[in-house]
């Protein structure tokens, strides 16, 4: 029967006794930077070309006897997971292997850099179709390794890496922390995060998604027909590299941003038991398990968005946190979150010719996060309209006044330390979808976009009594672009988007004291693109 | 994921550029920084990636590497250029004593220097 991991990544409509996805990734080349591999294994024979690249450190140990089969173990298994005949994800993909890890699975940042440079030079000398680079390795945070990954990604290469097996924040490791790389954590057959002894999968905001990574059957280097089960975030990354190869084979023109958005969009949502993660990391860690798209074509009509969390600002009074979108994504909204509730809101601002989302800590706060909503919106023209704090008691308001511009997100930022101690906030007048309204002490920022066929609407969910969480979701066919809270009172910790749902978090009910200021409204802005839908219909 | 400018959990040693008698001294006030792995056991002291500013050409990288070797030799230090990078990042990989870091950070075109460190199969 089909191994659990291949079943897990197969969309329900294709599930059968055999794993036979529609496209095997035949137009894509996958580079594997790992140990040496047994290229004559029946699973991968004729599919993997061993390059002459080798850059590895000496083995550790007072007595080291290397058996070829042991040296090849990790790389052979991963090559099998990506493209193996029987147990592989992308059975049609061709692979090239570079040896950057020694027989003990140890390498160096410098060896990995030289390997990445080798790939770039190969790409320049002999341009082929789409390239995927699988980096099933991790070391401590490295500025230079992240920079090299960024350069290679900007040259059109898709990099997929292991989040790391340290049961730790993936942002402390490289290349997992590189924003341009697709970083993959590991889950098991029960959709639990993978435990590896005392350790386990990494987590946090630097992880893009999870994939099967425990008890994965694949090629064993013990013999040319042997199979073995291995576990780790390398195995998870290999699944995503295989899925990416299949998506790129079906749509070779996909950019990295488009591929990442599709991987997120087609993932299984909210199936991971978050209790495994440390409490402070749960909100930052994506609850996504990778899966193949139900159809390899026809996803182009969708308006794709993802949520990007910043690093924590730190606790100093004037500390800020910045969340950025990828170069070919549009920042459609910006929100903020603080566990202590002490924050001074957020604003969208231009930095290096691109909008970023900046959140502001408040005096006595433990720090804030900025949360960017990053979307694929071709031919978009977006701008931020700001209204300074209002003199009148009615509150501050700002709207999209340019012809054809629609509201995609609202942010508010205030200089006073605690809005809750000032005049009571106003409620938003209804029936004005193109308008952001907020506290009179705050400046309000509206994200206004013009794009062919873009339409948006505001959806609200208010709760009169205090509650720790209020949510509002966009309906099928609409995509969440903006998420904010009304009113901006002191007990609101912040707002953020999880998939297509806007979440507004408030302080624990028992600590808020007075219930008079308890009303909280979650405001979602839901958009869709008729233009993309029409373009997709014309293609079909 | 990690901000590009968010040099996360690293030791950063910033040293002011000084003329040091160089013909091509860096602009006054610019600082090259030194980075190393926050996890001590994974550090590989003695091998360094010297990363040069973005638009540096291969010939300039090679010249900067040779200059480092010459200046190190004048101070009685042996160095070995293990690799010259081009195609992704301009720079070079050098085997040298950590005593030479201050000197290397003052070289023209240097953006930052990172001590080599280990990576592991996951």
């Amino acid at each position: 029967s089909i191994p659990w991991n291949l079943e897990r990544i197969t969309p329900p409509r294709y599930r059968a006794d055999e794993y036979q996805p529609p496209d095997g990734g035949s137009l894509v080349e996958v580079y594997l930077l790992d140990t040496s591999i047994q290229s004559d294994h029946r699973e991968i024979e004729g599919r993997v070309m061993v390059t002459d690249f080798e850059n590895v450190p000496e083995e550790d140990g007072t007595r080291f006897h290397s058996q070829a089969s042991k040296c090849d173990s990790h790389g052979t298994h991963l090559a099998g997971v990506v493209s193996g005949r029987d147990a592989g994800v992308a059975k049609g993909a061709s692979m090239r292997s570079l040896r950057v890890l020694n027989c003990q699975g140890k390498g160096t940042v410098s060896g990995t850099l030289i390997g990445l440079e080798f790939i770039r030079k190969s790409q320049l000398v002999q341009p082929v179709g789409p390239l995927v680079v699988l980096l099933p390795l991790a070391g401590g945070y490295s500025r230079v390794l992240n920079a090299a990954c960024q350069r290679l990604a900007r040259a059109g290469v898709v990099l997929v890496t292991a989040a790391g097996n340290f049961r730790d924040d993936a942002c402390l490791y490289s290349p997992a922390s590189a924003p341009e790389v697709i970083t993959v954590g590991a889950t098991n057959a029960q959709d639990q995060p993978v435990t590896l002894g005392t350790l386990g999968t990494n987590f946090g905001r630097c992880v893009d998604l999870f994939a099967p990574g425990e008890d994965i059957i694949g090629a064993s280097s013990d013999c040319s027909t042997c199979f073995v089960s291995q576990s780790g975030t390398s195995q998870a990354a290999a699944h995503v590299a295989g899925i990416a190869a299949m998506m790129l084979s079906a749509e070779p023109e996909l950019t990295l941003a488009e591929l990442r958005q599709r991987l997120i969009h087609f993932s299984a949502k909210d199936v991971i038991n978050e209790a495994w993660f440390p409490e402070d990391q749960r909100v930052l860690t994506p609850n996504l398990v990778a899966a193949l798209p139900p159809s390899t074509h026809g996803a182009g009509w969708q308006l794709f968005c993802r949520t990007v969390w910043s690093a924590h600002s730190g606790p100093t009074r004037m500390a800020t946190a910045v969340a950025r979108c990828a170069p070919d994504e549009e920042l459609l909204s910006c929100s903020s979150f603080s566990r202590s509730g002490k924050r001074r809101g957020e604003r969208m601002e231009a930095q290096g010719g691109k909008l970023v989302c900046r959140a502001h800590n408040a005096f006595g706060g433990e720090g804030v996060y900025a949360i960017a909503r990053c979307c694929l919106l071709p031919q978009a023209n977006c701008s931020v309209h700001t209204a300074p704090p209002a003199e009148a008691s009615m509150g501050t308001r700002v709207h999209c006044h340019q012809q054809g511009h629609v509201l995609t997100g609202c942010s508010s930022h205030w200089e006073v330390e605690d809005l809750g101690t000032h005049k009571p906030p106003v409620l938003r007048p209804r029936g004005q979808p193109n308008q952001c309204v907020g506290h009179r002490e705050a400046s309000i920022h509206a994200s206004c976009c013009h794009a062919p066929g873009l339409e948006c609407k505001v959806k609200e969910h208010g709760i009169p009594a205090p509650q720790e969480q209020v949510t509002v979701a966009c309906e099928e066919g609409w995509t969440l672009t903006g998420c904010s809270a009304l009113p901006g009172t002191s007990h609101v910790l912040g707002a953020y988007a999880v998939d297509n749902t806007c979440v507004v978090r408030s302080r624990d009910v028992s600590t808020t004291g007075s219930t008079s200021e308890g009303a909280v409204t979650a405001v979602a802005i839901c958009c869709r693109s008729r233009h993309l839908a029409q373009a997709s219909q014309e293609l079909q | 994921q990690e901000d590009e400018d968010g040099d996360y959990e690293e030791l950063v040693l910033a040293l002011r550029s000084e003329e040091d008698g160089l013909a091509e001294a860096p602009e006054h006030g610019t600082t090259a920084t030194f980075h190393r792995c926050a996890k001590d056991p994974w550090r590989l002291p003695g091998t360094y990636v010297v990363v040069l500013k973005e638009e540096t050409h291969l010939s300039q990288s090679e010249r900067t590497a040779r200059r480092l070797q010459a200046q190190a030799a004048r101070r009685g230090y042996l160095t070995k250029i293990l690799h010259v990078f081009h195609g992704l990042l301009p720079g070079f990989l050098v085997k040298m004593s950590g005593d030479l870091l201050e000197l290397a950070l003052k070289l023209p075109h240097v953006d930052y220097i990172e001590e080599d460190s280990s990576v592991f199969a996951q």
């Epitope: 007072t62 003990q104 | 056991p41």
Partner: antibody
Amino acid sequence: QVQLVQSGAEVKKPGSSVKVSCKASAFTFDSFGMHWVRQAPGQGLEWMGLLWSDGSGEYYADSAKGRFTISRDNSKNTLYLQMNSLRSDDTAVYYCARAMGAIYYYYAMDVWGQGTTVTVSS
Amino acid sequence: QSALTQPPSVSGSPGQSVTISCTGTSSNIGNQFVSWYQQLPGTAPKLMIYEYNKRPSGVPDRFSGSKSGNTASLTISGLQTGDEADYYCGSWDSSLSGYVFGTGTRVTVLG
């Protein structure tokens, strides 16, 4: 649950040999390095040696070099400590312990056996 | 193998905090990860802290580790009677190519 079960107590004469075993259960034995540690009566912990997960690399304490050999049979999920030329000061409780994770954390011990008492006395 | 240096004993009343130091050299604590182990009377040691300051799941957050230079420390806050045990630090030593343990510290809970 995850455990290491060691063989029973041994009483040996000086100059003789003994082989202590440690059987692993409920974890993938061949993914973990393994240590031996001993504790003489009323004394502290003394590390004896470490064997790589696949048996390909090893380290020994000076006091174990030449006389003690660590081996493993991954098909039986079992680790062994062969002790030759026993001396009275080898009298101790011998613990096997699992190395935490792969090569990057081989040196912390996260699961311990219950201990095997080896008494060397004439 | 020369051991890392720990105080033979420390004591405190229930609810108090105690700190155990572990001093080594640049070839062990200074440049290697440090672990801490608890050994209750008559039992095998148990890992409490690894990589200076990380706790395996199941270890209470009353136990915390830190490192400065060639010295590592284990702090037990909110001391409980069940914490009475011997505590050992441990670190790889790159010059010996071997693991070294501390001399051990007995923690006594008064009263």
